[in-house]
């Protein structure tokens, strides 16, 4: 859970209590044990742009 008073992390990143900052979810592929990766799994990925109107 994100610390009180912290701005929400941008899409594709998640709050790390161990590091006190937002971390890029992309790094979870290489190191899934990181504490913030739980937040990445819960957050939906950035939406794909539709190819039709």
């Amino acid at each position: 859970e994100q610390a009180p008073g912290q701005a929400p992390c941008s899409r594709g990143s998640s709050w790390s209590a161990d590091l006190d900052k937002c971390m890029d979810c992309a790094s979870c592929r290489a190191r899934p044990h990181s504490d913030f990766c739980l937040g990445c799994a819960a957050a939906p990925p950035a939406p794909f742009r539709l190819l039709w109107p």
């Epitope: 610390a3 209590a17 161990d18 590091l19 006190d20 290489a30 190191r31 044990h33 990181s34 504490d35």
Partner: antibody
Framework: EVQLLESGGGLVQPGGSLRLSCAAS????????MIWVRQAPGKGLEWVSY????????HYADSVKGRFTISRDNSKNTLYLQMNSLRAEDTAVYYC?????????????WGQGTLVTVSS | DIQMTQSPSSLSASVGDRVTITCRAS??????LNWYQQKPGKAPKLLIY???SLQSGVPSRFSGSGSGTDFTLTISSLQPEDFATYYC??????????FGQGTKVEIK
């Protein structure tokens, strides 16, 4: 110049308590994760505990969990290790070390160490 | 827990020798491997981080390589000040880190 200076070590009886300090200077202390690592006489390095930059997140080795408490005072640029219920196997030189500034992948600065001897 | 095993535990070498120390992880740790040098009575000193990156101020005769489970620290031409104990450390499971048991480099 980055410096980490441990203090508080000494001789203590089994079951006793000790509080180690690590005074940081030469850098802005508050953004960095910190750890304690120990080294028993003639042995290798053993990670003991970790604390996040704010102090809000802490982790411990199984060997010290429930007995040791890591904390920090960023206003005083100081890291602490409260050691309770000490055992003979806790006898070691205790080092504090600074984590890397982007992640805690490595520990780039270490103190000179303080010796803790647990003996009756 | 991830175990780190170094080999050899000790070695004897002469000034000018090329020295290689290996570190094996009990499971893949990608490239999250660091090397430290420790001299008697002194604190460990970071040499190599993330398997192959040379820490600032460390002589270029030190190099690191490897990924997955097998890693090496190489000293291309051993100098008198290099006689020490070397430790590997995995940070794949940071902040729960583990060290190898150490390799002592002695004078032949």
């Amino acid at each position: 110049e980055v410096q980490l200076l441990e203090s508080g070590g000494g001789l203590v009886q089994p079951g006793g308590s000790l509080r180690l300090s690590c005074a940081a200077s030469g850098f802005t202390f508050s953004p960095y994760p910190m750890i304690w690592v120990r080294q028993a006489p003639g042995k290798g390095l053993e990670w003991v505990s970790y604390i996040s930059p704010s102090g809000g997140s802490t982790h411990y080795a199984d060997s010290v969990k429930g007995r040791f408490t890591i904390s920090r005072d960023n206003s005083k640029n100081t890291l602490y290790l409260q050691m309770n219920s000490l055992r003979a196997e806790d006898t070691a030189v205790y080092y504090c070390a600074r984590g890397g500034d982007t992640y805690f992948d490595y520990f780039d600065y270490w103190g000179q160490g303080t010796l803790v001897t647990v003996s009756s | 827990d991830i175990q780190m095993t170094q080999s050899p535990s000790s070695l004897s070498a002469s000034v000018g020798d090329r020295v290689t120390i290996t570190c094996r992880a009990s499971q893949s740790i990608s490239g999250y491997l660091n090397w430290y040098q420790q001299k008697p009575g002194k604190a460990p000193k970071l040499l190599i981080y993330q398997a192959s990156s040379l820490q600032s101020g460390v002589p270029s005769r030190f190099s690191g390589s490897g990924s997955g489970t097998d890693f090496t620290l190489t000293i291309s031409s051993l100098q008198p000040e290099d006689f020490a104990t070397y430790y590997c450390q995995q940070s794949y499971t940071s902040p729960f880190i583990t060290f190898g048991q150490g390799t002592k480099v002695e004078i032949k």
